[in-house]
Amino acid sequence: GLDSPTGIDFSDITANSFTVHWIAPRATITGYRIRHHPEHFSGRPREDRVPHSRNSITLTNLTPGTEYVVSIVALNGREESPLLIGQQSTGGGGVSDVPRDLEVVAATPTSLLISWDAPAVTVRYYRITYGETGGNSPVQEFTVPGSKSTATISGLKPGVDYTITVYAVTGRGDSPASSKPISINYRT
């Protein structure tokens, strides 16, 4: 059968719109059908038929602070690929995209285990930065998948104050839409 598109991705997320990206299947296709609807919505989804040459679409007139389910099907005449499905929340509407309750849950003289509560939006990944509080040395940075809500920071100096910051990245990796960060200070 016809291969599905792959790599569903989201960017340019606002309260009323976001852009969906995907990777075309290798097979010859005539176009795509993109459907979207709010999660837990039983009505008829909105549907766009898009030419084969496109691999993105901006969905508009969305409801703020709402999780949307987006499905993409590749078409070749009457033949349809299996669904590619993704979910993305719009901004605003009282739904924050900032991680909450960042804390150190375990520590050694040279490492920290941090934990936070995920925001109520789809997070692609978290970007974590840490560095000596008030220090001149550059901060270190790493990422963890959006499915995680803990991270270990190692290689620290004993007895030093560190500032740790967690950003939720909700856009594409090459053009991240980062939330406001949450930060804490901790002395090893």
Epitope: I34, R46, E47, D48, R49, V50, P51, S53, R54, N55, S56, I57, T58, L59, T60, N61
Partner: antibody, heavy 115, light 107 residues
Amino acid sequence: EVQLLESGGGLVQPGGSLRLSCAASGFTFSSYAMSWVRQAPGKGLEWVSDIYDGGGTNYADSVKGRFTTSRDNSKNTLYLQMNSLRAEDTAVYYCAKTADNFDYWGQGTLVTVSS
Amino acid sequence: DIQMTQSPSSLSASVGDRVTITCRASQSISSYLNWYQQKPGKAPKLLIYAASTLQSGVPSRFSGSGSGTDFTLTISSLQPEDFATYYCQQANSAPTTFGQGTKVEIK
């Protein structure tokens, strides 16, 4: 007979706004993607935007964040809201039926951005 | 973006002449190539789509060929109403892009 009729063009200062309309008839408007294509004076054709049957959109990088395409299927009308206009946006703007193979075009409306 | 290059930029020909315009894509576009005719002060008109399929109502003296990166529009016997500017357009990948145009003038 398919007909597309643009309106709303005119002279606007840099930084200003303008809304173009395209009235469609002779086909089931709601079932088709529609596009805007522009042509600067004495120059070639440049794709501006698409809007698909469900209202989803795509834009050229040169207008992204400044132009918004919308449609009102109950009025068989396509719109192009143009904000933060620049001198380089000066062109005849055409609406065209479908994306990719532009099988029908309007007569165009001239937008001049100048102080 | 895919660049489309037409040649020649302009040509002079007489009624009855066979005219050939070429269009080259900067990368393969399969057969996703369309040709348009535009007369001064008028909107473009679709002549040929998918490289070689004649749009309904277009005279059979117009034909298109090619695939991959090299394409040709041929007018087998130029008529007075054919003096115009011709554009190619790739529809293989977004954004769709046009050639710079070929102006066909009367010799």
